[in-house]
Interface confidence: low
């Protein structure tokens, strides 16, 4: 008995060939001997089976002795043994229809679980293997689960169902809803305008939800909500914003926030959360702000940074075009009685300058001491 695998919703063509290469009488029946379709001369006739409106044949092939049974919009319950009777012979074809669906939505939040469920006919014992877009293979029976979805899991999952040494392939498009970056850091000199961008790693024509940016300033004892907003059809509308700092928000995606100026009291870490309509859970992106200030007070030239810097970052003070006068893995450095000229304060990581602030030191004219 020939075995053919089909996919739920697809079309399958079961073949039946006569030895004579001409149009002769044939008919297809199911295992209950109920006639599905056949011919009467050059006419297609249909029987009383439940397949009536979904069954067809290819008349153009009859003259060649081929009498296929075409079943459209396959259902799991179409799984059966189909019998083609032609020229006093019977050809049996076992059709097994499988379906593979994602547990809920195919749009899932980063960190959520994906469950794929296999629908299979009674009596079958298929095995399933799925390959994620990043090449990870998972195997299972009726259900396959992947916990903690990552951004790289977005894309087409290819699943192969194996039964009786035959296989059928399913493709399921999964979208992992996440920000492009889990975390970002912005380095600014005091007084500069700060731009925070929160690009999403997915696109949908409609996007509705609400969000909030909580900020933990380095100098503050507790975190504070800086802004809350709504997202409707990708249009952003601000619901509430603090007066200090007075953030501005772009009206379109990607989510974009502007801090009028970088100040030491704003340096710290923020967490932007986005709750999407009809989704449980939230998207998160961390953003960090490091602020630098260079000052000269009397005979002391000081450079300071505030915010979440890593211990390996180096802070230096140097006179332009000269070696660094002072370099430390600390958040403040200073030089007493600095020479006149343009001084540079540099925050660097393994030689790469992340932030630079220049300050001009003027010569001091000392009046001669009288004898």
């Amino acid at each position: 008995k020939k075995v053919v695998l089909g996919k739920k919703g697809d079309t399958v063509e079961l073949t039946c060939t006569a030895s004579q290469k001409k149009s002769i009488q044939f008919h297809w029946k199911n295992s209950n001997q109920i006639k599905i379709l056949g011919n009467q001369g050059s006419f297609l006739t249909k029987g009383p089976s439940k397949l009536n409106d979904r069954a067809d044949s290819r008349r153009s092939l009859w003259d060649q002795g081929n009498f296929p049974l075409i079943i459209k919009n396959l259902k799991i319950e179409d799984s059966d043994t189909y019998i083609c009777e032609v020229e006093d012979q019977k050809e049996e074809v076992q059709l097994l229809v499988f379906g593979l669906t994602a547990n809920s939505d195919t749009h899932l939040l980063q960190g959520q679980s994906l469950t794929l469920t296999l629908e299979s006919p009674p009596g079958s014992s298929p095995s399933v293997q799925c390959r994620s877009p990043r090449g990870k293979n998972i195997q299972g029976g009726k259900t396959l689960s992947v916990s903690q979805l990552e951004l790289q899991d977005s894309g087409t999952w290819t699943c192969t169902v194996l039964q009786n040494q035959k296989k059928v392939e399913f493709k399921i498009d999964i979208v992992v809803l996440a920000f492009q970056k889990a975390s970002s850091i912005v380095y600014k000199k005091e007084g500069e305008q700060v731009e925070f961008s929160f690009p999403l790693a997915f696109t949908v024509e409609k996007l509705t939800g609400s969000g909030e940016l909580w900020w933990q300033a380095e100098r503050a004892s507790s975190s504070k909500s800086w802004i809350t907003f709504d997202l409707k059809n990708k249009e952003v509308s601000v619901k509430r914003v603090t007066q200090d700092p007075k953030l501005q928000m772009g009206k379109k995606l990607p989510l974009h926030l502007t801090l009028p100026q970088a100040l030491p009291q704003y340096a710290g870490s923020g967490n932007l959360t986005l709750a999407l309509e009809a989704k449980t859970g939230k998207l998160h992106q961390e953003v960090n702000l490091v602020v630098m200030r260079a000052t000269q007070l009397q005979k002391n030239l000081t450079c300071e940074v505030w915010g979440p810097t890593s211990p390996k970052l180096m802070l230096s003070l140097k006179l332009e075009n000269k070696e660094a006068k002072v370099s430390k893995r600390e958040k403040a450095v200073w030089v007493l009685n600095p020479e006149a000229g343009m001084w540079q304060c540099l925050l660097s990581d393994s030689g790469q300058v992340l932030l630079e602030s220049n300050i001009k030191v003027l010569p001091t004219w000392s009046t001669p001491v009288q004898p």
């Epitope: 951004l151 977005s154 894309g155 492009q180 961008s197 690009p199 790693a201 696109t203 024509e205 409609k206 059809n233 990708k234 379109k252 995606l253 990607p254």
Partner: antibody
Framework: QVQLVQSGAEVKKPGASVKVSCKAS????????ISWVRQAPGQGLEWMGE????????YYNEKFKGRVTMTRDTSTSTVYMELSSLRSEDTAVYYC???????????WGQGTLVTVSS | DIVMTQSPDSLAVSLGERATINCKAS??????????MNWYQQKPGQPPKLLIY???NLESGVPDRFSGSGSGTDFTLTISSLQAEDVAVYYC?????????FGGGTKVEIK
């Protein structure tokens, strides 16, 4: 201001490949989708596909699948569109276009004429 | 794919007169209260320019003599008082579904 500057005109033989570049400036390159749209001489506009510069993910019109490849270089803020197995009917002006929101095209490159002729 | 059909193919209108271009989609381009229909203007040797988005929103910098209307499958671009600089080909485009598809274009000339 936002600018998309494309590479110059190309003449190719049937069966060859062409690679057109589109250099973006004036905005955060990774934040917006870049699409490629072509226009055959005296004809209408046809969307070929799009690339997400942040992730490098690309989505193609079924009509061009298997023949088109879209890539990006974030270090130079440049997007590339390569079309292979060229035929005479691929003779067209190829535009890159930046989406504003959804699939509407707010900013366009100047266009690159690709002529396929034996 | 959603098929966009524009009419007429060409249109000759006197200066200062109203020009109306129609666009019909093979299926509704409405979703959640919005119509995902855009209109572009293209002059010879230039890339298209976005005029109207989401059926009736005027893109910034576009003169207000241009307006868009419609919903579902039937849409209209109107130029209330045709100017010499409006001579161009106009295209409609749906942005509801991938692939985005364009109409065949309507050539607007001065009578």
């Amino acid at each position: 201001q936002v600018q998309l500057v494309q590479s110059g005109a190309e003449v190719k033989k049937p069966g060859a490949s062409v690679k057109v570049s589109c250099k973006a400036s004036g905005y955060t390159f990774t934040a917006y989708v870049i699409s490629w749209v072509r226009q055959a001489p005296g004809q209408g506009l046809e969307w070929m596909g799009e690339i997400y510069p942040g992730s490098g993910s690309s989505y193609y019109n079924e009509k061009f699948k298997g023949r088109v490849t879209m890539t990006r270089d974030t270090s130079t803020s440049t997007v590339y569109m390569e079309l292979s197995s060229l035929r005479s009917e691929d003779t067209a002006v190829y535009y890159c276009a930046r989406s504003g929101d959804g699939s509407r095209f707010v900013y366009w490159g100047q266009g690159t004429l690709v002529t396929v002729s034996s | 794919d959603i098929v966009m059909t524009q009419s007429p193919d060409s249109l000759a209108v006197s200066l200062g007169e109203r020009a109306t271009i129609n666009c019909k989609a093979s299926q509704s381009v409405d979703y959640d209260g919005d119509s995902y229909m855009n209109w572009y203007q293209q002059k010879p040797g230039q890339p298209p320019k976005l005029l109207i988005y989401v059926a009736s929103n005027l893109e910034s910098g576009v003169p207000d003599r241009f307006s868009g209307s419609g919903s579902g499958t039937d849409f209209t671009l109107t130029i209330s008082s045709l100017q010499a600089e409006d001579v161009a080909v106009y295209y409609c485009q749906q942005s509801l579904q991938d692939p985005p598809t364009f109409g065949g274009g309507t050539k607007v000339e001065i009578k």
